[in-house]
């Protein structure tokens, strides 16, 4: 069978905490060089389920700044520009990985943390529960 | 500005690569314990800009499995359940941090990488360019 050759240039892993503790190079490699810089930048205003972006800052976290979406309305904007409460604006959430300084205030020691962020909003048909 | 006191229990940072290379504990701490497990799980079907989720797996990346949203239609679903091409379904994208094995196949050495993922779709009013 295939043997995935372990790279001989790998750092030493004889750490007593291995494999829980790993070395991470914080020099970020950005794979998004060919993406449209506009991206979804104006969708928050043009959407039928518009949202506001709130800045969340935490110096003990990496990245320290995260933007959170909050839907502007309970309903969705209809063709007349009014809020239609027969539809619902809901946040689209995603779990993302961040680095949390651990122990606190340490410049070079982190722990992976999973947090839930709202990225934007979408308009959905509500689930109607009929009472018998 | 604020001066964060350095914790005396911090690991040694006399690494020649410091502060680019840090230690990270991969034991994930999940902050989402009180979140609704349903979350946006069915929004992809109920949205007026529905989407499909595609699996992307990569053992050289952490997390190794990422789900990408692809909008089902160019237009949005109207009240009659038909696609209305006067509106546009667009992906809501977010830059997220992942860990990339570096050098490749190394079990305990990573580099931070920024990738752009589509989390879901929203319905927007199109930008109409009028020709003079």
């Amino acid at each position: 069978g295939i043997t995935i050759p372990r790279n001989p240039g790998c750092p030493n892993s004889e750490d007593k905490n291995f494999p829980r503790t790993v070395m991470v190079n914080l020099n970020i490699h950005n794979r998004n060089t060919n993406t449209n810089p506009k991206r979804s930048s104006d969708y928050y205003n043009r959407s039928t389920s518009p949202w506001n972006l709130h800045r969340n800052e935490d110096p003990e976290r990496y990245p320290s700044v995260i933007w959170e979406a909050k839907c502007r309305h309970l309903g969705c904007i209809n063709a007349d520009g009014n809020v239609d409460y027969h539809m619902n604006s809901v946040p689209i959430q995603q779990e993302i990985l961040v680095l949390r300084r651990e122990p606190p205030h340490c410049p070079n020691s982190f722990r992976l943390e999973k947090i839930l962020v709202s990225v934007g909003c979408t308009c959905v048909t509500p689930i109607v529960h009929h009472v018998a | 500005g604020i001066t964060i006191p350095r914790n005396p229990g911090c690991p040694n940072s006399e690494d020649k690569n410091f502060p680019r290379t840090v230690m990270v504990n991969l034991n994930i701490h999940n902050r989402n314990t009180n979140t609704n497990p349903k979350r946006s799980s069915d929004y992809y079907n109920r949205s007026t800009s529905p989407w499909n989720l595609h699996r992307n797996e990569d053992p050289e990346r952490y997390p190794s499995v990422i789900w990408e949203a692809k909008c089902r239609h160019l237009g949005c679903i109207n009240a009659d359940g038909n696609v209305d091409y006067h509106m546009n379904s667009v992906p809501i994208q977010q830059e997220i941090l992942v860990l990339r094995r570096e050098p490749p196949h190394c079990p305990n050495s990573f580099r931070l990488e920024k990738i752009l993922v589509s989390v879901g779709c929203t319905c927007v009013t199109p930008i109409v360019h009028h020709v003079a």
Partner: antibody, heavy 124, light 110 residues
């Protein structure tokens, strides 16, 4: 030695059923996703189905969807392919193959171990 | 018809370099790493290259792979008689939700 051994092939009439087995040895079977791939006489390789390491997820080629079922018994280190409503175009050598990366992967690092194949002939 | 397109045949004399292309789309090669398989007549396929350009142990370094955009290629340098075989590219396809193989290329050593 890592090995996959298919069995259960044979000659069958159109519309009938057949069950293929693939016995695995030499690796921790329950850690790997598994595939079935077929090759019609004189033709190229055609992917049939994949099953996740724990059997919770399965995907099929459109040509076999609704007729074939992939399954596994990790306690017996065995992969199965249940083939119903067989057609002449299902005639092929059927190979089972193992995913290269261990864990929740369907295709990562390729299909690194293949069986020798078992022949299925659908003919009246 | 395969969603991954390969030339039906390629040939070269011993010692030469032969290249095989594999063309796909954004739903397959555009998003997933490509694998290459070698199949000699009468035998089961063998993994030759994985993750776009990595060789499993035991595969000679005469074989190299690359991937860019929606296409991939396999190069065989210093062609030898034992390289005479069928070669298939393969990857995952998001639209079909499955693993897909290329149409195959028969390499002949003249």
């Amino acid at each position: 030695e890592v090995q996959l051994l298919e069995s259960g092939g044979g000659v069958v009439q159109p519309g009938r059923s057949l069950r293929l087995s693939c016995a695995a040895s030499g690796f921790i079977f329950s850690n790997y996703g598994m595939h079935w791939v077929r090759q019609a006489p004189g033709k190229g390789l055609e992917w049939v189905a994949v099953i996740s390491y724990d059997g919770s997820n399965k995907y099929y080629a459109d040509s076999v969807k609704g007729r074939f079922t992939i399954s596994r018994d990790n306690s017996k280190n065995t992969l199965y392919l249940e083939m119903n409503s067989l057609r002449p175009e299902d005639t092929a050598v059927y190979y089972c193959a193992k995913v290269g990366a261990s864990g929740d992967y369907y295709y990562s690092y390729g299909l690194d171990v293949w069986g020798q194949g078992t022949t299925v002939t659908v003919s009246s | 018809q395969s969603v991954l397109t390969q030339p039906p045949s390629a040939s070269g004399t011993p010692g030469q370099t032969v290249s095989i292309s594999c063309s796909g789309s954004h739903s397959n090669i555009g998003r997933h790493p490509v694998d290459w398989y070698q199949q000699v007549p009468g035998a089961a396929p063998k993994l030759l290259m994985y993750y776009g350009g990595y060789r499993p142990s035991g595969v000679p370094d005469r074989f190299s792979g690359s991937q860019s955009g929606t296409s991939a290629s396999l190069a065989i340098s210093g062609l030898q008689s034992e390289d005479e075989a069928d070669y298939y590219c393969a990857t995952w396809d998001d639209r079909l939700v499955g693993y897909v193989f290329g149409s195959g290329t028969k390499v002949t050593v003249l």
